[in-house]
């Protein structure tokens, strides 16, 4: 048969052009991209390829070795001078490894027919590629018409005698894809119809989107879809110590590229992202939530000696409310208010102070007023009770002043102004307050209520009474007003420093009306209610003392 060089050579010997070709080709062959998985690469098969040529005198394998003495499987055919060529080369069974779309990359050289004298009528410059799907690894003895044509392969670059002389070989690379595949594997076939071809390498591969970590989610190796425009949705799984609100997904394109990420993983509380992994927060650092990017130092007055802390512990005497965020400093109760002053106006007291020197690190400082009524003799104090009114209020005061009204007159009071904040109730420590002692002004006394009759005679009535319930000061004297019943316009007034009097010069057997009031430095109180007593008749004995209702 005609050799590719256009002259005859000994059978089964590689012609010169093959040697030249292989040396040039080997420099460009081996590495393939990470998103391509080879199902067959004729360059890497060490032993027999197991391919079959028919007829036997068609395609022939040229046995060559590379610089490492590894075999190079090259098939050539050059029956350009003969009519009706139909030379087939069948590969062994190729597993598709679950891929539904595969790619075939051919590297070959093709002789320019114009450079072959006398072969113009029979010489071709193309060859055909076919495939046949099969689950059977031994199903190669099939008919030609069962093969499905993939394409007619033509060379972009053909070579001439001149190229051979210059030792320049023009290696063509053609890639075709096949799909969708439905069986476990397939056979490829190459049909020569009269060309001068050297098939240097056949690489069959599928494309995958290679496993990747994106946004802390691991996406596995994913074989691309059968359709060239198809995007496969792939779920990712979160890396160790990470969580997600929205499950991470990506789309694997037919070209083996990851596209359109959806969702992401976040390092869980106590962990932060570093170099695509979730690293533990070290002692002194914390992360309260997955939504926070990185571990932060413990806020002031807090610490953690743990790894993976989600919050920090407050130092001794410092506290954190449940509503305080973990990023907030631990705080403590405020110190006492300062420079408290009072202003007494009769039975009202106005208190004023300045805020504590130490607010405890909080802005929510307020004030509480405790009121105590003190007995100046016994030195005993008791709660003031509900009759006292506080303006604007007794607790939760935001301003540094308050007015107490409806106090008792001429009474010793102690007011404790306590500063409180959001953590005061968490602290077992002593209350922080400033005390103010005040005495209310004297006021007119309350009415006398309890009057007892003493000795009653025909011309005189003796009375006694108790000090008013609320003297509101020091009682200087009492004023007793009396008149004969129904003669109110003609009354007599007696003044007494004591709580007893005797009214004399009265008419026998007559009813007299008595009213008593007390006086302090602030003035007279109101008169008591009316008390009626009757003098005895002329001849009667004087009566015993008894209480008038």
């Amino acid at each position: 048969p005609a050799s590719l060089a256009g002259c005859y050579s000994a059978p089964r010997r590689a012609p010169l052009w093959t040697c030249l070709l292989l040396c040039a080709a080997l420099r460009t062959l081996l590495a393939s991209p990470s998103n391509e998985v080879n199902l067959l690469d004729s360059r890497t098969v060490m032993g027999d390829l197991g391919w079959i040529a028919f007829p036997k005198n068609g395609w022939e394998e040229i046995g060559e070795v590379d610089e490492n003495y590894a075999p190079i499987h090259t098939y050539q055919v050059c029956k350009v001078m003969e009519q009706n060529q139909n030379n087939w080369l069948l590969t062994s069974w190729i597993s598709n490894e679950g891929a539904s779309r595969i790619f075939i990359e051919l590297k070959f050289t093709l002789r320019d027919c114009n450079s072959l004298p006398g072969g113009l009528g029979t010489c071709k410059e193309t060859f055909n590629m076919y495939y046949f799907e099969s689950d059977d690894q031994n199903g190669r003895n099939i008919k030609e018409n069962q093969y499905i044509k993939i394409d007619t392969i033509a060379a972009d670059e053909s070579f001439t005698e001149l190229d051979l002389g210059d030792r320049v070989m023009k290696l063509n690379t053609e890639v075709r894809d096949v799909g969708p595949l439905s069986k476990k594997g397939f056979y490829l076939a190459f049909q020569d119809v009269g060309a001068c071809i050297a098939l240097v390498s056949v690489r069959v591969y599928y494309k995958k989107c290679p496993s990747v970590v994106r946004h802390l989610a691991v996406f596995p190796d994913t074989i691309t879809g059968a359709d060239s425009s198809q995007l496969l949705e792939v779920s990712g799984s979160c890396v160790n110590h990470s969580v997600t609100d929205e499950p991470p997904k990506m789309h694997c394109s037919a070209e083996g590229e990851w596209l359109v990420p959806i969702g992401k993983c976040m390092c869980k509380a106590g962990y932060e992202e570093k170099n695509g992994t979730c690293q533990v927060c070290r002692p002194g650092f914390f992360k309260a939530s997955p939504h926070i990017q990185s571990c932060g130092k413990c806020p002031p007055h807090s610490y953690t000696h743990e790894e993976a802390s989600t919050s920090c512990v407050c130092e001794k005497d410092y506290f954190r409310r449940e509503s305080d965020p973990p990023t907030m400093a631990c705080t403590r109760p405020p110190s006492a208010p300062r420079n408290a002053i009072s202003n007494v106006n009769e039975t009202s007291v106005f208190l004023e102070w300045i805020p504590p020197a130490d607010t405890g690190g909080r802005k929510d400082v307020s004030y509480y007023i405790a009121c105590k009524k003190c007995n100046s003799h016994a030195g005993v104090c008791e709660e003031c009770g509900g009759h006292v009114r506080y303006l604007p209020r007794q607790s939760g005061l935001k301003n540094t002043s308050v007015m107490m009204v409806d106090l008792l007159a001429h009474t010793n009071y102690t007011f404790e102004i306590e500063a409180v904040n959001g953590v005061s109730d968490l602290s077992p420590g002593a209350r922080q307050y400033v005390s103010v002692n005040v005495t209310t002004n004297q006021a007119a006394p309350s009415p006398v209520t309890n009057v007892k009759k003493g000795k009653i005679a025909k011309n005189s009535i003796s009375l006694s009474w108790q000090e008013p319930d609320r003297p509101n000061g020091i009682i200087l004297e009492y004023e007793i007003k009396y008149f004969e019943k129904d003669q109110e316009t003609s009354y007599t007034i007696i003044k007494s420093k004591e709580t007893t009097i005797t009214a004399e010069g009265l008419k026998p057997a007559s009813v007299y009306v008595f009213q008593i009031r007390a006086r302090t430095a602030a003035g007279y109180g109101v008169f008591s209610r009316r008390f009626e007593f009757e003098t005895t008749p002329v001849f009667a004995a004087s009566s015993d003392q008894s209480q008038i209702p």
Epitope: P283, Y303, H305, E306, E307, V313
Partner: antibody
Framework: EVQLVESGGGLVQPGGSLKLSCAAS????????IHWVRQAPGKGLEWVAS????????YYADSVKGRFTISRDNSKNTLYLQMNSLRAEDTAVYYC?????????????WGQGTLVTVSS | DIVMTQSPGSLAVSLGERATINCKAS??????????MNWYQQKPGKAPKLLIY???NLESGIPDRFSGSGSGTDFTLTISRLEEEDAASYYC?????????FGQGTKLEIK
């Protein structure tokens, strides 16, 4: 007042075992990391082991790894150091020390130490 | 392990004078802008006492004549005006990385 008191030291033969204790008071023991540090006679300080408050993080010096075990009982406010396969070079005063609260933390309170002598 | 090397091994300084002790770490003891370097004082028969934490922070109750400086691998403890009670051994310690290694110590004597 913060106090750390070590106990359990004494004379032990090479290959023997000893368990040291460190009783803590005056602070919230369960939230503090505690360390053991030792000092051979006439020598410098050597860090031995540490344990976090919740016992989640434990570290050892290479020289004691596999032989010593640090542990704590927060209900008893006590730290322990179980020492097995003792060697002559383990002879030292053993101190327990509290990890501080001011960042970055140092060892702010130390016990008075307990002497361990390994000798035949 | 991080190796801490102190210098000098011992020094004698007059009362009222400045004393300086150096500590060099075999690798950086910094993390996130802080230096994990502590200094301790130890007197014979006593437990060590924390003087400086975080390279330059004075521990509560320590006189302000003690100060610390440095970052990365090189650190210094300075006693500005030496007093009688400062005669002791001084140790640096890194707490950036387990194990928490100490320097070999520097013995300070009063001249």
């Amino acid at each position: 007042e913060v106090q750390l008191v070590e106990s359990g030291g004494g004379l032990v033969q090479p290959g023997g075992s000893l368990k040291l204790s460190c009783a803590a008071s005056g602070f919230t023991f369960s939230t503090f990391g505690i360390h053991w540090v030792r000092q051979a006679p006439g020598k410098g300080l050597e860090w031995v082991a540490s344990i976090s408050g919740a016992s989640t993080t434990i570290y050892y010096a290479d020289s004691v790894k596999g032989r010593f075990t640090i542990s704590r009982d927060n209900s008893k406010n006590t730290l322990y150091l179980q020492m097995n396969s003792l060697r002559a070079e383990d002879t030292a005063v053993y101190y327990c020390a509290r990890y501080g609260t001011s960042f970055p933390y140092g060892l702010d309170y130390w016990g008075q130490g307990t002497l361990v002598t390994v000798s035949s | 392990d991080i190796v801490m090397t102190q210098s000098p091994g011992s020094l004698a300084v007059s009362l009222g004078e400045r004393a300086t002790i150096n500590c060099k770490a075999s690798q950086s003891v910094d993390y996130d802008g802080d230096s994990y370097m502590n200094w301790y004082q130890q007197k014979p028969g006593k437990a060590p006492k924390l003087l400086i934490y975080g390279a330059s922070n004075l521990e509560s109750g320590i006189p302000d004549r003690f100060s610390g400086s440095g970052s990365g691998t090189d650190f210094t403890l300075t006693i500005s005006r030496l007093e009688e009670e400062d005669a002791a051994s001084y140790y640096c310690q890194q707490s950036n990385e387990d194990p928490f290694t100490f320097g070999q110590g520097t013995k300070l004597e009063i001249k």
